[in-house]
């Protein structure tokens, strides 16, 4: 048993990080492989991950973490039963990758716009709450043209859209992913899109 | 009520061997990691050895390295130094005391919160 | 290893009197912010000793309020703000960010 492709991890900066690594062959992964974790720090466990299968050769663990801190480095070791098949270690300040934003919501009830809210997904005293900016995607199913990126750089979780600037008579859709400056992350993942329909018409005289 | 309780110490002529022992009752022993401390006659406080919750990690005094052995019997709330080639040097009251939260992925520090009574160690000829 | 140094080693204080006891480590003992592995210990004569104070600033249960501890990365501060008879005895630091976990000399305070 070998593994092709090293476990690389990242870390939410809150409660779990997330390992993949892909085999040198199919593998039954939660039945044959263990990811073993260990803070390194005075009198710390030894914690086991079991990972799931991610495709036929891949592999994913969850490690349930603690709140992250600068300090925090783990070491890492891959076992298929008695045989060590990778040794290393993960710093997850260094590693990060933000939580998606979650229940996005689009007001269209508001005069000539379309206002997008979202929710932060980390809670105010998590370091990451005040250093989150955002990418929302805004495209059309009936027209496959269109399709734009919106940054938003202020820490309100808003944008809003002139409706004029829309397709009236036309369904959109939009998702909405984090990254944390500071912190040198990665994207998040995407919320889970929302749809609605673009209602507005200009008025008579400016037509 | 939370408590420790030391027991072995005794008499013991230099290149001799004792085996202290401490039980716990009163918390989850198994939880916590362990530490041994001593003070020689008219001395300060001297940190020998500690164990995490689950035994897997132990930790010695560079002085007592290669001599002692710490240990713990989870399921009889027990924790252990083995002294081997036991000193002059090593005369002590050796007090046991419970330390960190180890089971945590992160172990919690609350201090040193509960020590025993200290058992004393002559080591002599 | 770390180095725990405390000063003074020995503390004659009149009751009622504040007394404050220094202790500096060779190396910050700050893991993150609010976590500082040092302790505070008094030992009565006679007794095992005894917790005041973790993680730098945070009093042990049913320590009375008038020992405080302060201080971050590698200088510490034990103050005890009125002293009474009964807090006589030796008061150790001790660094318990990483073993060997060190205690500093002892400070002996009695009273005048």
């Known amino acids: 048993m070998k593994v092709l492709q090293e476990p690389a991890c990242v870390s939410d900066y809150m409660s779990i990080s997330t390992c993949e690594w892909k085999m040198g062959g199919p593998t039954n992964c939660s039945a044959e492989l263990r990811l073993l974790y260990q803070l390194v720090f005075q009198s710390s466990e030894t914690h086991t991950c079991v990972p799931e299968n991610n495709g036929g050769v891949g592999c994913v663990c969850h490690l349930l973490m603690d709140d992250v801190v600068s300090m925090d480095n783990y070491t890492l070791d891959l076992w298929a039963g008695q045989q060590l098949l990778w040794k290393g270690s993960f710093k997850p300040s260094e590693h990060v990758k933000p939580r998606a934003p979650g229940n996005l919501t689009v007001h269209t009830n508001v005069s000539d716009t379309v206002l997008l809210t979202w929710s932060n997904p980390y809670p105010p005293d998590n370091y990451l709450y005040n250093d989150l900016t955002y990418a929302v995607n805004i495209w059309s199913e009936n027209d496959p043209a269109y399709s734009r990126i919106h940054n938003v750089t202020y820490l309100k979780p808003t944008l809003r859209i002139p409706a004029s600037t829309l397709k009236s008579g036309i369904s959109y859709r939009a998702r909405v992913r984090a990254w944390a400056q500071h912190y040198n992350t990665t994207w998040s993942e995407w919320s889970p899109s929302t749809k609605w329909y673009n209602s507005y018409r200009e008025p008579f005289e400016q037509r | 009520e939370v408590q420790l309780v030391e027991s072995g110490g005794g008499l013991e002529q230099p290149g001799g061997s004792l085996r202290l022992s401490c039980a716990g009752s009163?918390?989850?022993?198994?939880?916590?990691?362990m530490t041994w401390v001593r003070q020689a006659p008219g001395k300060g406080l001297e940190w020998v050895s500690s164990?995490?919750?689950?035994?897997?990690?132990?930790y010695y005094a560079d002085s007592v390295k290669g001599r002692f052995t710490i240990s713990r019997d989870n399921s009889k709330n027990t924790l252990y130094l083995q002294m081997n080639s036991l000193r002059a040097e090593d005369t002590a009251v050796y007090y046991c005391?419970?330390?960190?939260?180890?089971?945590?992925?992160?172990?919690?520090?609350?201090?040193?919160?509960?020590w025993g009574q200290g058992t004393t160690v002559t080591v002599s000829s | 290893d770390i180095v725990m140094t405390q000063s003074p080693l020995s503390l004659p204080v009149t009751p009622g009197e504040p007394a404050s006891i220094s202790c500096r480590s060779s190396?910050?003992?700050?893991?993150?912010?609010?976590?500082?592995?040092v302790d505070w210990y008094l030992q009565k004569s006679g007794q095992s000793p005894q917790l005041l104070i973790y993680?730098?600033?945070k009093r042990a249960s049913g320590v009375p309020d008038r020992f405080s501890g302060s201080g971050s990365g590698t200088d510490f501060t034990l103050k005890i703000s009125r002293v009474e008879a009964e807090d006589v005895g030796f008061y150790y630091c001790?660094?318990?960010?990483?073993?060997?976990?060190?205690f500093g000399q002892g400070t002996k305070l009695e009273i005048k």
């Open positions: 005391a419970k330390d960190r939260l180890s089971k945590t992925i992160r172990p919690r520090y609350y201090g040193l919160d509960v």
């Open positions: 009163g918390f989850t022993f198994r939880d916590f990691a």
């Open positions: 164990v995490s919750g689950d035994g897997g990690n132990t």
């Open positions: 190396q910050s003992v700050l893991y993150s912010i609010g976590y500082n592995y």
């Open positions: 993680l730098g600033n």
């Open positions: 001790m660094q318990a960010y990483q073993s060997p976990y060190v």
